[in-house]
């Protein structure tokens, strides 16, 4: 079948990294610089993706595979194949349309990306707060008050220093 197909279509013999050149009697020509063909039998080579500006090259383009981009430090990839870069924030912050903002009281973010999430409500599981939450860390829940030995006490979260929902400036 392969022989029959190649007799009918000389282009099917052209391997990845080449294209079937109609201008040169359908011989297999190497892909020009900054282009590639990832499969055989191609009539054109595709232009490589350019990783420019906020993007940096994670993998160079070759004659058989496209370039791959990631983001420069201070940004992280979003979208299919890193089609966008989003600004990093610090732990304890989230990204809003106006930039990085500290997590509101009662919420935390332990990553440089994503949104602030509410602290775990230990009492919903019948547990007590063992370690208080911060902007960067969730609370740590301990055993339920009933599980504590006589005389032991659980850590009580301090009263909020400001109105819940207000973000420090």
């Amino acid at each position: 079948f392969e022989r029959t197909r190649s007799l009918q279509d000389p282009c099917s013999n052209c391997p990845a990294g080449t294209f079937c050149d109609n201008n040169r009697n359908q011989i297999c020509s190497p892909c020009p610089p900054n282009s590639f063909s990832s499969a055989g039998g191609q009539r054109t080579c595709d232009i490589c993706r350019q990783c420019k500006g906020v993007f940096r090259t994670r993998k160079e383009c070759s004659s058989t595979s496209n370039a791959e981009c990631d983001c420069t430090p201070g940004f992280h990839c979003l979208g299919a194949g890193c089609s966008m870069c989003e600004q990093d924030c610090k732990q304890g912050q989230e990204l809003t349309k106006k930039g990085c903002k500290d997590c509101c009281f009662g919420t935390f973010n332990d990553q440089k990306r994503g949104i602030c999430r509410p602290w775990t409500n230990c009492s919903l599981d019948g547990k007590s707060v063992l370690v208080n939450g911060t902007k960067e860390r969730d609370v740590v829940c301990g055993p339920s008050p009933a599980d504590l030995s006589p005389g032991a006490s659980s850590v009580t979260p301090p009263a909020p220093a400001r109105e819940p929902g207000h973000s420090p400036q």
Epitope: R49, Q50, V54, L78, S83, K97
Partner: antibody
Framework: EVQLVESGGGLVQPGGSLRLSCAAS??????????VGWIRQAPGKGLEWIGE???????YYSPSLKSRVTISRDNSKNTLYLQLNSLKAEDTAVYYC???????????????WGQGTLVTVSS | DIQLTQSPSSLSASVGDRVTITCRAS??????LAWYQQKPGKAPKLLIY???SLESGVPSRFSGSGSGTDFTLTISSLQPEDFATYYC????????FGQGTKVEIK
Amino acid sequence: EVQLVESGGGLVQPGGSLRLSCAASGFSLSTSGVGVGWIRQAPGKGLEWIGEIYHSGSTYYSPSLKSRVTISRDNSKNTLYLQLNSLKAEDTAVYYCAREGSDVVTGDWFAYWGQGTLVTVSS
Amino acid sequence: DIQLTQSPSSLSASVGDRVTITCRASQGISSVLAWYQQKPGKAPKLLIYDASSLESGVPSRFSGSGSGTDFTLTISSLQPEDFATYYCQQGYSLWTFGQGTKVEIK
């Protein structure tokens, strides 16, 4: 608030040169990830990308204009420049500068545009 | 260069109509495509980036779709202020714009 203001347009003789300025405010041209480009539009025609400069100083140019164009910037003035040489009548257009990316997400699109400056090439 | 071909070049529509504009790339460009609206005497305005992400402040009647070589801008219910020229733009390799689609009043 991001603002881009072009200046330097006007009447230029064929064969001459133009130097356009784009004053940026609300952001710094040297901030990591920032790219600013020049795009032009001939009367009644579509948009044509000319070139781009990044925070790193790296530049990219349209292949059809590469031999005649230079994009530069002055970080102390937060200003971008376009130099175009050997002008022809076909270079008559409104020239826009535009910044890549949106507020917190950036990529290869133009979210902020200046109002444009008209360049007329005629004797 | 990567070429972008928009269709139609112009169209006539009425307020309330659903309008679809297509943009075809000469090769695959993943989702690295944006759409702009331009009114006479004004600078273009970004509507959609990354093929389908709506720019902040743009009405939700605008939407984008597609990946690879075929992309679409849809206006779900045309409003009087939407009569303008629309351009697609790729940034996959350098930058190029489509030739534009003029949306006129029927």
